[in-house]
């Protein structure tokens, strides 16, 4: 039960996180005009990964896309790449984790397969979250650097007389959305990895021996009552005593790679 809850919660948290990463990537407010200690302009500038916008005092907003690839700063391209990689990995992770969910039964999928898929999606969520956090952090660092550079030349003299209104940019809402979303995806991934341990089969690498009685048959499986190290009940060892006789092949268990986690 605890495994299902952990896995389900991990999935939901990751889903919210990935939705947040997508939202942050699409948002226009990655950097917004700094209004503190600045000449108050009647226009408000803000920029995203894909376009820059200007809002007039009337509320009229005009946005222009960056219709160039080569002309954009390498850092911006890197941030775009990190966010897209994060989204792609997260989307694949979500797809994998849906099939890995313990509460969903698809054919006769083995628990070991579900454990593998849970671990895979968990790792994908972790990497996705890290990509988003890295992307947002790179952009934030770029902003901080530019902020202090423009503060240093707040008023650049032109011909000694003319002053330039230096538009300084500060952290936009998308950065905070991205950080939170990346963190949630990361947490969700960790939860999936933890859930994977509970899903993993716990049998030891012994050949099962079948004892055939003439009357009421009982299959005895060594290690059947061994303590589970996972978070949930030992899923492979639920039915120890069964009414019908079993062949050796039926009760024989093979070690899973998760037995040694």
């Amino acid at each position: 039960m605890a495994v299902t809850a952990c896995q389900g919660l991990g999935f939901v948290v990751s889903l919210i996180g990935i939705a947040g990463i997508i939202a942050a990537t699409c948002m226009d407010q990655w950097s917004t005009q700094d209004l503190y200690n600045n000449p108050v302009t009647a226009v408000f500038n803000y920029q995203g990964l894909w376009r820059s916008c200007v809002r007039e005092s009337s509320g009229f907003t005009e946005c222009r896309g960056y219709f160039t690839l080569l002309g954009l700063p390498a850092m911006l391209q890197a941030v775009r790449a990190l966010m897209i990689v994060g989204i792609v990995l997260g989307a694949i992770g979500l797809l994998v984790s849906i099939f890995a969910l313990k509460c969903i039964r698809i054919g006769s999928m083995e628990d070991s397969a579900k454990a593998n898929m849970t671990l895979t999606s968990g790792i994908m969520f972790i990497v996705s979250g890290l990509c988003a956090i890295a992307g947002v952090s790179v952009f934030a660092n770029m902003l901080v650097t530019n902020f202090w550079m423009s503060t240093a030349n707040m008023y650049t003299g032109m011909g000694g007389m003319v002053q330039t209104v230096q538009t300084r940019y500060t952290f936009g809402a998308a950065l905070f959305v991205g950080w939170v979303a990346g963190g949630l995806t990361l947490i969700g991934g960790v939860m999936m990895c933890i859930a994977c341990r509970g899903l993993a089969p716990e049998e030891t690498n012994y050949k099962a021996v079948s004892y055939h009685a003439s009357g009421h048959s009982v299959a005895y499986k060594p290690g059947g009552f061994k303590a589970s190290t996972g978070f949930g009940s030992n899923t492979k060892n639920k039915k120890i005593y069964d009414g019908g006789a079993r062949t050796e092949d039926e009760v024989q268990s093979y070690p899973s790679k998760h037995d040694y986690v």
Partner: antibody, heavy 119, light 113 residues
């Protein structure tokens, strides 16, 4: 077509206050900024300040802070400018002007109110 | 505050002539976000309120005759009337509508011979 109606003239005594009105018709009043501009004989135009009726957000020229108070009555689509502690320096034509939607320029102007400060 | 300096303060021309008036600001009025210059030109005829002619330094307001042309960038702006008509007798003001407080130039008075 947007129209801004202002009273033609106001005669006030020094030290007194006056409240100039500007009634808008033919547009969504709350959407656009309403600005006030002062014009003294033989001098240029001076921006006093602006108010956004939607949220009563104001912007004042620091030179007129304490002198002018901008308010709006959304129900009657009317903007008001109160001028206090009047002196002869305040004798001028006061225009209300509605901001454009697409830019910060003043697209529509009232005919102006002549404020005369005289004992 | 941004200071808008207009020149000349007045000029007298004959109908059909080309007129150029200048406006200089002590601070750049170019917004880097959209590469627009926030300068507006108004025409004030005697006994009338000002009328919007040109915004964003070069965009003509609807209904304004195409003989009026605005140009310039950052700190230097120009209003050109390609062929002056008798009805163009007025005072022309440039305005900073970028940085608060909005400021106007002292005006250029256009007189017709």
């Amino acid at each position: 077509q947007v129209q801004l109606q202002q009273p033609g003239a106001e005669l006030v005594k020094p030290g007194a206050s006056v409240k100039v009105s500007c009634k808008a018709s033919g547009s969504t009043f709350t959407t656009y900024w309403m600005h006030w501009v002062k014009k003294r004989p033989g001098q240029g135009l001076e921006w006093i300040g602006g108010i956004r009726p939607f949220d009563s957000n104001t912007n004042y020229n620091h030179k007129f802070k304490g002198k002018a108070t901008l308010t709006v009555d959304k129900a009657s689509s009317t903007a008001y400018m109160q001028l206090s502690s009047l002196t002869s320096e305040d004798s001028a034509v006061y225009y209300c002007a509605m901001g454009a939607y697409y830019s910060n320029s003043f697209a529509y102007w009232g005919q102006g109110t002549v404020v005369t400060v005289s004992a | 505050d941004i200071v808008m300096t207009q020149s000349p303060s007045s000029l007298t021309v004959t109908a059909g002539e080309k007129v150029t008036m200048n406006c200089k600001s002590n601070q750049s009025l170019l917004n880097s976000g959209n590469q627009k210059n926030y300068v507006t030109w108004y025409q004030q005829k005697p006994g009338q309120p000002p009328k919007l002619l040109i915004f964003w330094a070069s965009t003509r307001e609807s209904g304004v005759p195409d003989r009026f042309t605005g140009s310039g960038s950052e700190t230097d702006f120009t209003l050109i009337i390609s062929s002056v008509q008798a009805e163009d007798l007025a005072v022309y003001y440039c305005q900073n509508d970028y940085v608060y407080p909005f400021t106007f130039g002292s005006g250029t008075k256009l007189e017709i011979k």
